[in-house]
């Protein structure tokens, strides 16, 4: 069901011509258009040193509709905008200008950021990342038999990648030493990746030191476990034979 | 003469998305914004957003603006509204509108959307 | 965001009297002289159809009953003589600012 509209009564002008060009309601042979059909913008237009009235479906570019009974004009838009509903909702700024809430700003409001490709002002989106993933099985060269000691992997997802202001992303990839039961590998069984493979727990109160790879220190935002106190970590080594070791990777 | 086509009733669990479409007949559909508006079951009127179908700008209200996209298909003279993330307070009948002049002068016949699980 | 009071919240009306609606705005939606005010009726299952646009015109093929007025922050709808059909929720909507925003609406009722 949709809402209809009547036709909009037009009186006629005096000495006017009835023969008018497509969409004028009205017009004369020197003015062009004088009046229009309804769902039409009344514009003049220069013709050399003549002005001449045209009927248009839609406002050109940097002008906006704004209806009157007896006419619908064409207005333009503020001069920092592009394309608008009226002077004071822009939808569009011109270049070097943000557009936020239907205005153009040099710059953005305190707690949005400019977005170069849309030329918005938007709010500032941080990192959002998963729950980790469970630790993957112990291995070392790609097997899970025939060593003591291998890494452990676990990594999570970036749910939402910050904006150019918001926080950086935390590690996504978390590895560390592990320690298994010594056990032969059976024949055919090198090379394979165990998934049901027993790991061997840290000692009750042992912390997983976490020591980031290169390409964590990239990051400019330090995590706090991932800072270690040196003479903790020697006591640390002479303790502790079976210390489990974690590496982050931050993307 | 002019007319707004949308698309059907839409049953939807909470976190899905659902995509409406608006037809548009009885004038060149690249001449108007074409604007989104909901009401939910009792209530008022609420502004969406809009887009222009000449060149696909669009426009969103801050409240909607990370779920909401608007886009046109200008071959078939339809523009559409896509939901994502859907919670229960998305219930609400969604209407498409012709922006003329700064007033909605024709509106589609309404889109039904429960969002239950 | 332009915030839109209407009042009363209903109203019952007995036929051939006048309905009076008032809209507030939070700030003002003038612009340049004209000010960006429209009010639309609905009917229950039906979409809203325009009644009067920038406060005081009369939409094409809407009786002459239904006028509006007013200018800046306050606006009133009147509906004179009230008829049977006019039973409906009257709405108004401001197009000076983003985003753009409706009152609450005015429910008519017939006495």
């Known amino acids: 069901q949709n809402a209809s509209r009547g036709r909009r009564q037009r009186r006629m002008h005096p000495n006017v011509s009835q023969g008018c060009q497509g969409g004028c309601a009205t017009c004369s042979d020197y003015n062009g258009c004088l009046s229009c059909k309804p769902r039409l913008f009344f514009a003049l237009e220069r013709i050399g040193m003549k002005q001449i009235g045209v009927c248009l479906s839609s406002c050109p570019s940097g002008y906006y509709g704004t209806r009157y009974p007896d006419i619908n004009k064409c207005t333009k838009c503020k001069a920092d905008c592009d394309t608008c509903f009226n002077k004071n909702f822009c939808t569009k700024c011109k270049s070097g200008f943000y557009l936020h809430l239907g205005k153009c700003l040099d710059n953005c409001p305190e707690g949005l950021e400019a977005n170069n490709h849309t030329m918005e002002c938007v709010s500032i989106v941080h990192c959002e990342v998963s729950e980790w993933n469970p630790w993957s099985p112990c291995t070392k060269k790609g097997k899970t038999c025939g060593f003591k000691r291998g890494t452990e992997t676990r990594v999570r997802e970036i749910i939402q990648h910050p904006s150019a202001k918001g926080n950086l992303c935390p590690p996504t990839n978390e590895t560390r030493k592990c320690t298994v039961q010594r056990k032969k590998c059976q024949k055919g069984e090198r090379g394979k990746k165990g998934r049901e493979r027993k790991r061997k727990k840290p000692n009750k109160g042992e912390s997983k030191e976490a020591i980031p790879d290169s390409k964590s220190l990239e990051s400019s935002k330090e995590i706090p476990e991932q800072r270690e106190n040196k003479q903790q970590q020697k006591k640390r080594k002479v303790q502790d034979k079976q210390k489990s070791v974690s590496v982050s990777t931050v993307h | 003469q002019v007319q707004l086509v949308q698309s059907g009733a839409e049953v939807k669990k909470p976190g899905a998305s659902v995509k409406v479409s608006c037809k548009a007949s009885g004038y060149t559909f690249t001449d108007y914004s074409i604007h989104w508006v909901r009401q939910a079951p009792g209530q008022g009127l609420e502004w969406i957003g809009y887009i222009y179908p000449s060149n696909g700008d669009s426009g969103y209200n801050q409240k909607f603006k990370n779920r909401v996209t608007m886009t046109r298909d200008t071959s078939t003279s339809t523009a559409y509204m896509e939901l994502s993330r859907l919670r229960s307070e998305d219930t609400a009948v969604y209407y498409c509108a012709t922006y003329f002049a700064n007033n909605f002068d024709y509106w589609g016949q309404g889109t039904t959307l429960t969002v239950s699980s | 965001d332009i915030v839109l009071t209407q009042s009363p919240a209903s109203l019952a009306v007995s036929l051939g009297q006048r309905a009076t609606i008032s809209c507030k705005a939070s700030q003002s939606v003038d612009y340049d002289g004209d000010s960006y005010m429209n009010w639309y009726q609905q009917k229950p299952g039906q979409p809203p159809k325009l009644l009067i646009y920038a406060a005081s015109n009369l939409e094409s093929g809407i009786p002459a009953r239904f006028s509006g007025s007013g200018s800046g922050t306050d606006f009133t709808l009147n509906i004179h003589p009230v008829e049977e059909e006019d039973a409906a929720t009257y709405y108004c909507?401001?197009?000076?600012?983003?985003?753009?925003?409706f009152g609450a609406g005015t429910k008519l009722e017939l006495k």
């Open positions: 909507q401001q197009s000076n600012e983003d985003p753009l925003t």
